[in-house]
């Protein structure tokens, strides 16, 4: 979690002098409670917006908006604390609106916005706006919270953000998978414009089950520049297990901007239409066991052969 570095955030508006300050998320009014405190925010809304940094990078940001209730407690409102909590990491970032002048009622409802919290793709957040000073320990709460889901890099607008592009969102491999015969699977995909290697992860499943009956990893070496954007094809040899017919192919790139954490693309081949009397899967069907210290997938030589070449 971080704040956008540009432009400088502004909270002042007509009729209100205000400045935005970094906050420890522990306002002084927690420690030294006041007798008179303002009511809670009204109509808190969080939306996904996009903003450019000074360097021209595009980031997703949480656009936070709320209004004030039309009661006399605005006379005691000294500011607001905005808090964003990333739910999985438990990381919290806060800023404080410090009012430098007293609020007065006027013809329109007071409305505040803030769009400087940078958020991550595919993450979940809780956004809280606390009016300041915070209430005494047993006082009515004067904050409002809302949860906020940030889409992943498949989302059209997210795809072109800097964090998504860094993880390879612009690469569309357009995978096609074709069963050549009971023992061979052909995978075609488009290479990206980077001299980096790829891995093809094949996982096969019985017709109606989610437990794999065959797994295989195939390494594709880095293409030469003249092969960029070309189609590459690989023929994978399957273990001949009856009923092990649903194949999921996942392609993992290793781009320099994301290394082991690049977006993966996958395609699935369904089992052929079942005959009226399907043959049962034998009890003794061998399932591989990982060697100690190995990755999730065994080496090619344990899995039958495979070969590939690039189309020009």
């Amino acid at each position: 979690l971080r704040l956008l570095d540009f432009p400088a955030p502004v909270c002042a508006q007509e009729g209100l002098s205000c400045r935005v300050k970094n906050s420890t998320c522990l306002d002084d009014s927690w420690i030294h409670p006041r007798n008179l405190t303002p009511s809670s925010p009204k109509d808190l809304q969080i939306q996904l917006h996009f903003a450019h940094t000074q360097q021209g990078d595009l980031f997703p940001v949480a656009h936070i908006e709320w209004t004030l209730q039309t009661d006399a407690s605005i006379l005691y409102l000294e500011g607001a604390e905005l808090s964003v909590l990333q739910l999985n990491t438990n990381e919290r970032l806060c800023v404080r609106f410090e009012f430098l002048s007293k609020l007065r009622h006027h013809h329109r409802r007071w409305r505040f916005t803030f769009s400087h919290f940078v958020v991550d793709p595919d993450q979940e957040y809780e956004v809280t706006v606390h009016h300041l000073p915070k209430p005494i320990p047993d006082g009515d709460p004067n904050h409002q919270s809302k949860n906020f889901l940030v889409p992943d890099c498949e989302h059209a607008r997210m795809k072109v953000t800097t964090p998504c592009m860094s993880s390879g969102s612009l690469w569309d491999p357009n995978i096609t998978v074709e069963t050549l015969d009971t023992q061979h699977l052909r995978v075609d995909f488009t290479l990206w414009n980077e001299s980096t290697h790829y891995q093809i992860l094949l996982t096969s499943f019985p017709h109606m089950e989610n437990h794999s009956c065959f797994e295989h990893m195939h390494h594709i070496p880095a293409p030469r520049p003249e092969e960029f954007h070309q189609r590459s094809n690989v023929t994978l040899t399957l273990r001949n297990l009856k009923g092990c017919c649903r194949h999921q192919v996942q392609i993992q790139p290793f781009f320099s901007s994301c290394l082991n954490d690049c977006l993966r693309h996958s395609a699935t081949v369904s089992c052929p239409e079942m005959p009226d009397t399907p043959e049962p899967i034998p009890d003794y069907m061998p399932l591989w066991e990982p060697r100690s210290g190995s990755s999730d997938y065994k080496d090619d030589d344990d899995k039958g052969s495979s070969h590939h070449h690039h189309h020009h």
Epitope: L87, N88, K146, N147, L149, D261
Partner: antibody, heavy 116, light 107 residues
Framework: QVQLVQSGAEVKKPGASVKVSCKAS????????ISWVRQAPGQGLEWMGW????????NYAQKLQGRVTMTTDTSTSTAYMELRSLRSDDTAVYYC?????????WGQGTLVTVSS | EIVMTQSPATLSVSPGERVTLSCRAS??????LAWFQQKPGQAPRPLIY???TRAAGIPARFSGSGSGTDFTLTISSLQSEDFAVYYC?????????FGGGTKVEIK
Amino acid sequence: QVQLVQSGAEVKKPGASVKVSCKASGYTFTRYGISWVRQAPGQGLEWMGWISAYSGNTNYAQKLQGRVTMTTDTSTSTAYMELRSLRSDDTAVYYCARRQLYFDYWGQGTLVTVSS
Amino acid sequence: EIVMTQSPATLSVSPGERVTLSCRASQSVSSNLAWFQQKPGQAPRPLIYDASTRAAGIPARFSGSGSGTDFTLTISSLQSEDFAVYYCQQYDNWPLTFGGGTKVEIK
């Protein structure tokens, strides 16, 4: 392929405890939280709470507070939900699901029967 | 807590028909709403999140709409595999809550 595989069915006596496991695979375990949802026979879905797989932080439904504990073991990419002081109305299918707000992948469910 | 109310409780329809399911929140949940499909003996399957975004692999015949307190799940042409129970869920605030479900059965 993202998968959440849960432990098998359990039969427990009232007052006992049950611990259900949920083994995750196919993604980086610590990148997402794990939520737990239960469903009594013939009834709807009830949110029980979540645990952050990254920080271990938890958020439990108020009605289960004090009786439920959610934990994770990152070395085995497994989440656990323990429910204590079981009552007959805890009889349900217990599901684990990936994420803390929107549940994009679910386990197959674990039937917990509480009966004397 | 936010109460989610689904209607109708049961819907009897024929394959090929257009189906509209309703979900109402007791207070605004913005667009923080998901829809799930559940068949007997199976875990719920995500269909829609953020009120209108289809989950991965969900056919285009499923669509979601609405914001604030009123939401709709529409199945444009019901297929035989769509007969199931459908649940809405809000994730705007804690505790997360589900609707009671709408059972879509064969007429």
